[in-house]
Structure formats: C-alpha cells, structure tokens
Interface confidence: low
C-alpha cells in the first residue's frame, strides 16, 4: 500500500484591507489534488495574536477566513490540508503546516501613544471617545482617530474632534448606522515634527459601553398603610425597557439608607405611618440580556415627599 499524502495549501497569507484590525486570511488549494477530484478537501486553520496562549481553530472548505485582531501585537497563523477518511478509505490524512505572520512595524516609543483612552456610547446613540496625549510629547503633536466596523466601505477619520490647547483629545462620532453587536475598530495615530508617534488600536462592541440617560418621572403611590410604591419611567431613546437594570437609593427621615437593584420600573417599600420624609433617586444600566457590560447612568433628580399624608398625594415630577 502506498501511503497517501497531501500537500499544504499554497500562498497562505494574511491580508490587511485597512480595517484597523479586521484581517483576511487567505490561501490557495494544495498542489497535486488530481487524485482527489471526487473529494471535498477541508482546511484546518489556527491563528492568534502573538503572545496569546490559545489558538483559535477553524475547519473550513473555503479559501478565506476573516476575523478581528489586536494590531498592537503581531499575528501568527498556520494552516494544513485535511483529507477526510471517506477520501482515503481509512483514517483522515493531514498535510504539514503552512505558516505565516503579520504585524504593523511600530513607529515611535510606546510612551508617545495616547493614554487613558475612554469610549462611551451615550444612550445607545452617541459615541464619544477621549484620551490624553502621550507622556512627554510636545504641543506640536497631534492625534488622529480612525474607525471602522462591518458595513463601512473603508475606515473613516473623525470629523468632529474635541480639542484642548490646540491638540485633539477626543472625538464625537456621527450617527453610526447598524454598528452594535459587532466589533468596532479604532486606531489613534499621531504626527509630530520632532519624533515618530506610536499608533494605538482598540476594539470593542458598542452595546457593551452604553451609558444610558437617567430614569425620569419619579413618583410615589401609597399602596397600603405600610407599603409605598416607587415608580419611574425609562428615558427617551432607542434602549428598550427590557434592556434596563436599575439601582435605587432611598432615604427615610435622613437616617436609613436603602439601596436595591431591580429589573422593573417599580419598587415597593415597606414603611411606617411615622415616616415624615422619604426621598429616592434611581439610575439605570444596560442589563445582561442586551450586553455583556455597561456603565451606570447618572443618578436621576431626587424625588422627595415631606410632611404630607402620602395616601392623599401622588407626586409627579
């Protein structure tokens, strides 16, 4: 019996289309596939950022694959050909690995790149990113922000910079159509007459950095002699009610502080007829059903009842 062998894929390469971290891995079929014309060849692809402990593994019949990477680090990938057992009358046959790497040659020392990059997607509507200039860079240094997500033809530059002392220190983004639940890629690079500036790359998903508006229309209703219902409304905007968690702070007669986290726009408080003053505030956050992470809103305006019979009065802010 002659041993069945198969070659690795040809022309394996990582292609950077200029999408700030979203790369194409592509290859060509192996040489000498004539013996296996009736056979569907598969490829096992492994790839990772250099320094990562684990490889991502994909088995595909295609000649390309796309994924996002951290361009602050290099990328390594390897691929081999798989002949399924149906093609070989026995066990699966694997070729040797073809390997490739990709990295962006870094310019400038790390200290020149932007510091403390912070991005917030306000009310799931308005994205704002801010940063501090690199350590020791001169005032002639300016930074430029570029961004891309699937749906854009090419990376776009910020058109509305936030400035301080003539330097760009932030970006207000335009309306970003169909941009959540997918990776959002940012590059902040810089220029200076005196020294090269290191670029920084960031990737996140917008739904995970949402800071909602605070709840509105806080009200009290006496439910019974010992229960008061606190109610509020979700703020205007695109975030559906099912996506909110709330945190409440309640102060009774300036002594007791109650804090609670709830999923609905109501909270029932046990109280006594002796309660003279009751105040509460609420803040909101996108919950785990709609995102993996989020930022608490600011606290709502405080709503207080003081010195009147709650059973006779419902307060509406």
């Amino acid at each position: 019996d002659t041993e069945i062998k198969v070659n690795p894929p040809q022309d394996f390469e990582i292609v950077d289309p200029g999408y700030l971290g979203y790369l194409y891995l592509q290859w060509q079929p192996p040489l000498s596939l004539d013996h296996f014309k009736e056979c569907t060849v598969e490829y096992e692809l492994k790839y990772r950022n250099i320094g990562s402990e684990t490889w991502k593994t994909i088995i595909t019949k295609n000649l390309h694959y796309k994924d996002g990477f951290d361009l602050n680090k290099g990328i390594e990938a390897k691929i081999h050909t798989l002949l399924p057992w149906q093609c070989t009358n026995g066990s699966e046959v694997q070729s040797s690995w073809a390997e490739t790497t990709y990295w962006i040659s870094p310019q400038g020392i790390p200290e020149t790149k932007v510091q403390d990059m912070d991005c917030v997607y306000y009310n799931w509507q308005y994205l704002l990113c801010s940063w501090k200039p690199g350590i020791g860079v001169l005032l002639d240094t300016n930074y430029n922000l570029f961004y891309w997500y699937e749906g854009l033809d090419h990376a776009l530059q910020c058109v509305d910079y936030i400035k301080a002392d003539g330097q760009n220190i932030g970006c207000r983004f335009p309306y970003l159509e169909a941009s959540d639940y997918k990776d959002f890629y940012i590059c902040v690079n810089g220029s200076s007459e005196n020294k090269p500036i290191r670029s920084s790359y960031f990737t996140f998903q917008l739904q995970n950095i949402v800071k909602p508006l605070p709840p509105v229309y806080l009200t009290f209703t006496r439910e019974s002699s010992c229960e008061i219902k606190l109610k509020w409304s979700i703020p205007l905007g695109p975030i559906p009610a099912r996506c909110f968690d709330y945190e409440i702070e309640i102060r009774e007669d300036d002594t007791t502080l109650v804090t609670a986290t709830v999923e609905n726009e109501t909270y029932t408080l046990k109280t006594t007829n002796e309660t003279r003053q009751l105040c509460f505030v609420v803040r909101s956050k996108v919950n785990i059903y709609c995102s993996d992470d989020g930022i608490w809103s600011e606290w709502s305006d405080k709503q207080c009842w003081e010195g009147e019979d709650l059973s006779k009065k419902t307060l509406l802010r």
Epitope: N62, H64, Y65, K66, E150, G151, L152, D153, A178, Y181, K182, P240, C243, I288, Y289, C290, S291
Partner: antibody, heavy 119, light 111 residues
Framework: QVQLVQSGAEVVKPGASVKLSCKAS????????MNWVKQAPGQGLEWIGR????????HYNQKFKDRATLTVDKSTSTVYMELSSLRSEDTAVYYC????????????WGQGTLVTVSS | DIQMTQSPSSLSASVGDRVTITCRAS??????????MNWFQQKPGKAPKLLIY???RQGSGDPSRFSGSGSGTDFTLTISSLQPEDFATYFC?????????FGQGTKVEIK
C-alpha cells in the same frame, strides 16, 4: 445609494432551468450576504437561501436545496440563483435582498424577477 | 422549522387609527439578548421594505409611528396613527434559525 438590480422576466417550460441575476451597487459588496426570497402570485414570502458575497458560503432552505444553486461573481458584484427542474408551482416573483447579519434583517431588496413556468 | 403565525390576517382601519399586529413564533427567537424578529411592509407590485429589525429597532428612514415590541415568542408591530400610505400588507419574519421563515401576512385595508 444601495441598489440591487435584477434580471428581466422569464417564461420557461416545465423541467427546464432558469438562472436569475442580481447586480449590487452603492455599497461594499463583499461585506454582506445576499438572500433570495420567493413570492408566488397572491401568496406570502418564502426564504430560499443566502450566500456570503465574500467567501461564497451558502445556507439553503431544505425545501429548495436540491433545486436552487446560489453563486457569486465578486468581479461584477453580482449574485446568481439557478433554479432547476422547474414546475408550475415555481411560478413566482423572486427577490434578492441584502443582509448584513442575522439580527439586522434584509434591509435592501431588488425589484423582483417574475418567472412563469408554462408549457 | 420555526413557524410564524400572524394575526389578524386582515383588518380594516381608518386614517389616524392605532393599529396593532401580532406575531407568534413556534419557539423562542431570542439569542444573545437579541430577538431575531423583523417586520416588513409590502405594497402591491412592490418589493417588501424593512420596517423593524431585532424586534424593536427601526429600519433606517422609517417613520417613527412604526414601532415593534416583544421577546421570546410573542411580538407586536404597532402603527400609532395610521396614514394613507400605510395601507399595505405586513409580514413578520424570524432570522434566528435557517430556514428563515415569514408570517402569512396581515393586510391593512381602508375602512
């Protein structure tokens, strides 16, 4: 602006095949899937399948899997659907419709191609 | 396959009316905290038009009088104040699982 322009109406005999085209413009063709949807006269909508314009990966409705073949020509930003072994119940308008991902819906549609199967 | 059942199959309404169309899936169409539910409008002789995606998100350029709600298996399309151009057929569609499936449609007619 996004445009999907489909080929003209076809009259074909039972048992024959037909190949419909859908030419895309106004967006990055390879970033999206292209779906095909059938609408028989006076009837509802029926999803046939979709193709990834970048990699050529296909997903089919099992009902059409043996008779529908989706292909893509990236050089002309055109997607094709070939329907074989035609029968009278295949008489319908066939639409192509662009979609980014499962959660985003089919946001742009072609004008439709009427296929009439008649002897 | 996931079956989609719309109700009513047709309704008569007047301009200015609030109209509600419901759609029930045979199993949950939720995943990753998203409802994979879309709503389309179709006028005679025209291609469908996306109104709502992900259960409650408006398609680009659609009037704010169209809104979607629901999760799991039960979903609603609401037209807050019916306009003359809204008389059409409306379809729900799930995109959680291949094959994607549509409701049978709801025809909104002039009373």
């Amino acid at each position: 602006q996004v445009q999907l322009v489909q080929s003209g109406a076809e009259v074909v005999k039972p048992g024959a095949s037909v190949k419909l085209s859908c030419k895309a413009s106004g967006y990055t063709f390879t970033n999206y899937w292209m779906n095909w949807v059938k609408q028989a006269p006076g009837q509802g909508l029926e999803w046939i399948g979709r193709i990834d314009a970048y990699a050529g990966e296909t997903h089919y409705n099992q009902k059409f899997k043996d008779r529908a073949t989706l292909t893509v020509d990236k050089s002309t930003s055109t997607v094709y659907m070939e329907l074989s072994s035609l029968r009278s119940e295949d008489t319908a308008v066939y639409y192509c419709a662009r979609g980014y991902g499962d959660a985003y819906g089919m946001d742009h549609w072609g004008q439709g191609t009427l296929v009439t199967v008649s002897s | 396959d996931i079956q989609m059942t719309q109700s009513p199959s047709s309704l008569s309404a007047s301009v200015g009316d609030r109209v509600t169309i419901t759609c029930r899936a045979s199993e949950s169409v939720d995943n990753y905290g998203i409802s994979f539910m879309n709503w389309f409008q179709q006028k005679p002789g025209k291609a469908p038009k996306l109104l709502i995606y992900a259960a409650s998100r408006q398609g680009s350029g659609d009037p704010s009088r169209f809104s979607g709600s629901g999760s799991g298996t039960d979903f609603t399309l609401t037209i807050s104040s019916l306009q003359p151009e809204d008389f059409a057929t409306y379809f729900c569609q799930q995109s959680k699982e291949v094959p994607w499936t549509f409701g049978q449609g709801t025809k909104v007619e002039i009373k």
